[in-house]
Interface confidence: low
């Protein structure tokens, strides 16, 4: 028999410097957690102890704080690079900006191989992007060798910019080919590494054959075995396993989010290739893992430029922006208007003649926006600015609901009206109004919103059974402020894009905003 | 032209599934609706639910939830509709209807020529 | 669920007639109306959707009325082509049901 570890990360959005316990700004740095500096003492140690040990990537390292805004993949390259990562599979957000956005920075600068076999360059990208990510790679582990084959949810049109030069084919029919290939060149113990969730990396175990492990990402999955270490309750047993369909038992595996947890996955295979056994948990890379000086100190030397980017002007607003809670938690305020006009624009992706764009929605719960922006300041609006509007570290996810979860939202949106709670809802895309002489749950007198199926975009009465998709705060995604109908309810949920590079980003082409309160939301009294 | 055409008549045992196909020809398949409807004879039209060819989502009619199931392949511009634990008042005609989407403008501009299925022991 | 009640159930008239044959909705749906036409061993053919907005290569001698829970199917002078049966679907919230039918034969 011969052992395997396997130590993995996704999903780790930029997340270079320890966090606190939700991922967010480190506070008190006694309770922070995860970081490279401390990811890499876990992973020497391990190194130290165990022979044959694989460090692998689920993807989505791209995106998720100010180190991606300012530094835009060359800082994953780097420390990626100082971890000696052995391979990573290309998550949606390593397209967020554009496919050169992925080739400088990380695919020419990585110095491990970067995988995905469902995506293929066409056109004049073909012969660029030749040779610079590959659909597998032979490893040599010891004395025998391991194949990793790479996956990308193809959902990535839709989620980030891959332009129109990259075809994304179903994981599973791209993946058994190169599987079967594997298999030619002698390989015979295959890990599929690979960035589409949870159910489709289930899908892959139990449906492409010849796939020994799979280790997934993008649905920020945590599973545990025994009792969880944190605030994080698992979705199943570490390994999950998976009977595929010609009878083997697959470990699935996956490590939650942010680099908070480095996971932990001890397989043994016979001589043929076939997995004996398999064991393991994520490990919380907690403040008793100390983090590793050189890394800290490289960690440190980059942060310089980050402090002062923070200060520099992003764009003018020649009005003000009011984000008080006044306003924004008891009506239309502009600067919710603001915000999910950068929402909806973020998400623009122009990828069927039969839509001008995918998404025309956005919901915003009022008790998200944190302050206003004075225009008296010479107009200007800095990162620094936007962080106090948006101080919670969140991103701006993209869901699918039905009307019916979108009507019972707007409901609870008002459900206690004048008590200056966050639920209340800014809006994009969306024309909504209230009766407040109703009793709760029955105040949406009229909602419409904007089609998307449409060359000119107009509002027409939500459908309680159309799905729809919706541009929200992760936290309104995970049912926060109330909206357990959301998290309950939704059809589908991808991650987006930090919540403040959404809005800067958005400043920063629009040079000059004058956002305004326009009757997205409007109160009425008596019949409809 | 723009066209459905469906698979030919089924004769199947009460407990059976049936599964019958819709080809689409003349236009994108992926950007419209393909929704299911039977007719038992001399009875009224009555609508069992849809797909979404391009994602693959789907809306099913209460009635049928559980015993109706509508797939579709892309690459051959082709929808599915399933019925299992087939009994007597299953024997209809099952149609199946492209739904324009655009613009909120919703109705069933095309049909195919319709499945007879009889269920009979 | 929304039902669909049309009437009548059927109808005797002569070429050259006006006939109107009503849909009523169990709920409001908003305009979200189709019409249609089918003969015997046929599929139904679209009529009108929008509850009035005729569809394409319809004779302009149907149209449609309504809104709210009512809705109605006027054929302004009945040509001998047109005696099939009739049915009215709401497109508002799921099931989308369609009416019973009207049978329209000749007197």
């Known amino acids: 028999a011969w052992e395997l570890t396997i130590l993995h990360t996704n999903d780790v959005h930029s997340r270079l410097e320890q966090t606190s316990e939700d991922s967010s700004k480190c506070v008190n740095a006694s309770r922070c957690m995860g970081g490279v500096a401390r990811l890499f003492t876990k992973v020497q140690q391990i190194r130290r102890a165990e022979p044959n040990v694989l460090l692998l990537d689920a993807g989505d390292q791209y995106q998720g704080t100010i180190w991606f805004t300012v530094y835009k993949g060359a800082e994953v390259a780097h420390f990626m690079n100082a971890l000696r990562y052995d391979a990573m599979a290309l998550g949606n957000h390593e397209f967020d900006n554009g496919v050169e956005g992925l080739i400088e920075p990380l695919l020419k600068e990585a110095k491990f191989p970067i995988l995905s076999a469902n995506i293929k360059a066409k056109g004049p990208l073909a012969s660029q992007i030749s040779g610079l990510y590959l659909p597998y790679k032979v490893l040599p582990v010891g004395d025998e060798v391991v194949g990793i084959v790479g996956y990308t949810s193809k959902e990535t049109p839709f989620l980030s910019n891959p332009g129109t030069n990259l075809v994304f084919e179903d994981e599973i029919t791209a993946l058994q080919p190169e599987v079967d290939k594997l298999k030619t060149l002698n390989v015979n113990k295959i890990i599929a590494l690979g960035h589409s969730g949870f159910e489709m990396d289930k899908l892959i175990a139990q449906k492409v054959r010849g796939v020994d492990v799979v280790v997934g990402g993008h649905s920020n999955t945590f599973l545990y075995t025994g009792n969880p270490p944190s605030k994080e309750v698992p979705a199943g047993k570490y390994p999950f396993i998976v009977t595929s369909d010609d009878g083997r038992k697959v470990p699935v595996v996956q490590a939650y989010a942010f680099g908070k947890y480095l996971g932990y996955l001890k397989i043994e295979f016979d001589e043929r290739g076939n997995v004996i056994s398999s064991h393991g948990n994520p490990i919380l890379l907690n403040s008793s893992i100390p983090e590793d000086p050189s890394i800290k100190a490289d960690i440190n030397k980059w942060r310089i430029k980050l402090d002062n980017y923070s200060t520099q002007e992003l764009g003018k607003t020649i009005v003000y922006l009011d984000g008080s809670s006044q306003s924004c938690r008891f009506r239309e305020c502009n600067m919710g208007n603001l915000i999910c006009d950068a929402m909806i624009n973020n998400n623009l992706r122009h990828t069927d003649e039969m839509f001008w764009n995918h998404v025309s929605m956005c919901i915003l719960n009022g008790g998200g926006i944190r302050s206003p922006i004075d225009e008296r300041n010479n107009g200007t609006i800095t990162w620094e600015n936007l962080a106090a509007v948006l101080p919670f570290g969140g991103t701006f996810d993209l869901v699918q609901l039905k009307g019916s979860t979108l009507k019972k939202a707007f409901e609870h949106s008002v459900h206690r009206y004048g008590q200056s709670t966050g639920e209340f809802l800014q809006v994009g895309g969306i024309h909504v109004v209230y009766d407040l002489s109703r009793k709760p749950g029955d105040r949406v007198v009229k909602l419409d919103v904007l089609c998307t199926k449409c060359r000119v975009p107009s509002y027409d009465p939500l459908k309680m059974d159309e799905v729809y998709k919706v541009i929200l705060p992760n936290f309104l995604a995970n049912g926060g402020d109330g909206f357990q109908m959301i998290k309950d309810e939704l059809l589908r949920h991808d991650s987006g894009d930090q919540d403040i590079n959404v809005v800067s980003t958005y400043i920063s082409k629009m040079k000059v905003i004058y956002p305004a309160v326009e009757g997205r939301i409007k109160f009425s009294t008596g019949s409809h | 032209q723009v066209q459905l055409v469906q698979s030919g008549a089924e004769v199947k045992k009460p407990g059976a599934s049936v599964k019958v196909s819709c080809k689409a020809s003349?236009?994108?398949?992926?950007?419209?609706?393909i929704n299911w409807v039977r007719q038992a004879t001399g009875q009224g039209l009555e609508w069992m639910g849809w797909i979404y060819p391009r994602d693959g989502f789907t809306g099913y009619a209460q009635k049928f939830q559980g015993r109706v199931t509508i797939t579709r392949n892309t690459s051959i511009s082709t929808a599915y509709m399933e019925l299992s634990s087939l009994r007597s008042e299953d024997t209809a005609v099952y149609y199946c209807a492209r739904k324009e989407g655009y613009r909120g403008d919703w109705y069933f501009d095309v049909w195919g020529q319709g499945t007879t299925v009889t269920v009979s022991s | 669920d929304i039902q669909m009640t049309q009437s009548p159930s059927s109808l005797s008239a002569s070429v050259g007639d006006r006939v109107t044959i009503t849909c009523r909705a169990s709920g409001n749906v908003h305009n979200y109306l189709a019409w249609y036409q089918q003969k015997p061993g046929k599929a139904p053919k679209l009529l009108l959707y929008n509850a009035k907005t005729l569809a394409s290569g319809v004779p302009s001698r149907f149209s449609g009325s309504g809104s709210g829970t009512d809705y109605t199917l006027t054929i302004s002078s009945l040509q001998p082509e047109d005696f099939a049966t009739y049915y009215c679907q709401h497109f508002w919230s799921t099931p989308w049901t369609f009416g019973g039918g009207t049978e329209l034969e000749i007197k």
């Open positions: 003349g236009y994108t398949f992926t950007s419209y609706d």
